[in-house]
C-alpha cells in the first residue's frame, strides 16, 4: 500500500458543498474507491465487468458519486466546520492483477466563505 | 546483489507430480509480484503463473487446477506445486521479479525485470 | 485476450547495420505496459525497454522502443555482434496478466 497526498486539486467547493476528487489510473478495468473521513469510511463505489464487458457499479456505502473514465467525485453538502479533517481515496485495483492497494488524500480546510447557510 | 535461484527440476512421468523452489537475495522479496514463465526447447516464452504480494494467485489457462504458486515471505521463497502432469508441460520454469508501482492515479510497469537462470522439468514415459 | 504478433520471424542482417523488429497487438494496449526482452541461447531472457520506449538499466542507447496503440517497434541503431538473439514483446494486460509475442530471431547473415 502506498500512502500520499494528492498531487491535483482534490476538493472543489460549489453551492455549499464539495466535490472529493479521486481519481484513479485509466488502465484500471475493476476497483474499490473508498472515501475515508480519518479512519472512518463515508462513502464506496465498486466498478465490475461481467461477461461480455458488461460494467457493474455498486455501492455499500451509498453518496452521490459521479463516475468518468479515470476518477470518481464523491459530493458532500451542507457543509459545516465538522467537515474539516482529512479525506482520503482508498482505491482497491482488481484488474489489472495482481491486486493492489494504494491511499491518496489531503485535509479539507472549510472556511466561512465556503459554508453552506451563513448568518446574515 | 538481485538475484532468483531455481531448483527442483528434473524428469518425472505423466501424471506425476514435482514442486519448484525459487530463493531470491538481495532485495526486499515481500514487496514484488513473482511469476514463474516457461519455454519449451526451441519455443517461445509462455507466462505460467503469478502471485501477488497480497498473496492473491492468477494462472494461465492450460495449468489452472494442477500448477500452485505460493509464496513464503519468511524464507524470501517462491514455490511452484505441479500436479497431474503433462507430457506439455516439458520445459525450462523461470522465477520472476514482477516491478510495479500505484500511486494514487498512476500506475508504472518496469517490466519483469530479474530471472532465475531456469530449472529444466521433462515429463516423459 | 490480447495477441501479440511480432515479425518478421526471423531477421538477417550484418554487424553496423540497423534492426526495425515489429509487435503488432490485437487491439490497442497501454504505452505503459509495453515491454521488450532479449535472450540469447542458454540464458534467461533479459529486460531491454519498458513503458514502450524507456531503457532498462545498464542497456545501451543504440536499443530504442517506440510506438502506440497495436504498433510498436524495437529499433537497434547499428548491430553489435553481441545483440544477435531473439527479442520479445510483452504486454501487462487483465487475462492473462502476462501475454508476449512469439519473438523475432536476429541472426547474422
Known amino acids: 500500500e502506498i500512502n500520499g497526498s494528492a498531487n491535483y486539486e482534490m476538493f472543489i467547493f460549489h453551492n455549499g458543498g464539495v466535490q472529493i476528487l479521486c481519481k484513479y489510473p485509466d488502465i484500471v478495468q475493476q476497483f474499490k474507491m473508498q472515501l475515508l473521513k480519518g479512519g472512518q469510511i463515508l462513502c464506496d463505489l465498486t466498478k465490475t465487468k461481467g461477461s461480455g464487458n458488461t460494467v457493474s457499479i455498486k455501492s455499500l456505502k451509498f453518496c452521490h458519486s459521479q463516475l468518468s473514465n479515470n476518477s470518481v467525485s464523491f459530493f458532500l453538502y451542507n457543509l459545516d466546520h465538522s467537515h474539516a479533517n482529512y479525506y482520503f481515496c482508498n482505491l482497491s485495483i482488481f484488474d489489472p492483477p495482481p491486486f493492489k492497494v494504494t491511499l491518496t488524500g489531503g485535509y479539507l480546510h472549510i472556511y466561512e466563505s465556503q459554508l453552506c447557510c451563513q448568518l446574515k | 546483489e538481485v538475484q532468483l535461484v531455481e531448483s527442483g527440476g528434473g524428469l518425472v512421468q505423466p501424471g506425476g507430480s514435482l514442486r519448484l523452489s525459487c530463493a531470491a537475495s538481495?532485495?526486499?522479496?515481500?514487496?514484488?509480484?513473482m511469476h514463474w514463465v516457461r519455454q519449451a526447447t526451441g519455443k517461445g516464452l509462455e507466462w505460467v503463473a503469478l502471485?501477488?504480494?497480497?498473496?492473491?494467485?492468477y494462472y494461465s489457462d492450460s495449468v489452472k487446477g494442477r500448477l500452485t504458486i505460493s509464496r513464503e515471505n519468511a524464507k524470501k521463497s517462491l514455490y511452484l506445486q505441479m500436479n497431474s502432469l503433462r507430457v506439455g508441460d516439458t520445459a525450462v520454469y523461470y522465477c520472476?521479479?514482477?516491478?510495479?508501482?500505484?500511486?494514487?492515479?498512476?500506475?508504472?510497469?518496469?517490466?519483469?525485470?530479474?530471472w532465475g537462470q531456469g530449472t529444466t522439468v521433462t515429463v516423459s514415459s | 485476450e490480447i495477441v501479440l504478433t511480432q515479425s518478421p520471424g526471423t531477421l538477417s542482417l550484418s554487424p553496423g547495420e540497423r534492426a526495425t523488429l515489429s509487435c503488432r497487438a490485437s487491439q490497442s494496449v497501454s504505452t505503459s505496459s509495453l515491454v521488450w526482452y532479449q535472450q540469447k541461447p542458454g540464458q534467461a531472457p533479459r529486460l531491454l525497454i519498458y513503458g514502450a520506449s524507456t531503457r532498462a538499466t545498464g542497456i545501451p542507447d543504440r536499443f530504442s522502443g517506440s510506438g502506440s496503440g497495436t504498433d510498436f517497434t524495437l529499433t537497434i541503431s547499428r548491430l553489435e555482434p553481441e545483440d544477435f538473439a531473439v527479442y520479445y514483446c510483452q504486454q501487462f494486460g487483465s487475462s492473462p496478466p502476462i501475454t508476449f509475442g512469439q519473438g523475432t530471431r536476429l541472426e547474422i547473415k
Open positions: 502471485i501477488g504480494t497480497a498473496g492473491d494467485t
Open positions: 538481495g532485495f526486499t522479496f515481500n514487496g514484488y509480484d
Open positions: 520472476v521479479r514482477d516491478r510495479r508501482a500505484v500511486a494514487g492515479h498512476y500506475y508504472y510497469f518496469y517490466g519483469l525485470d530479474v
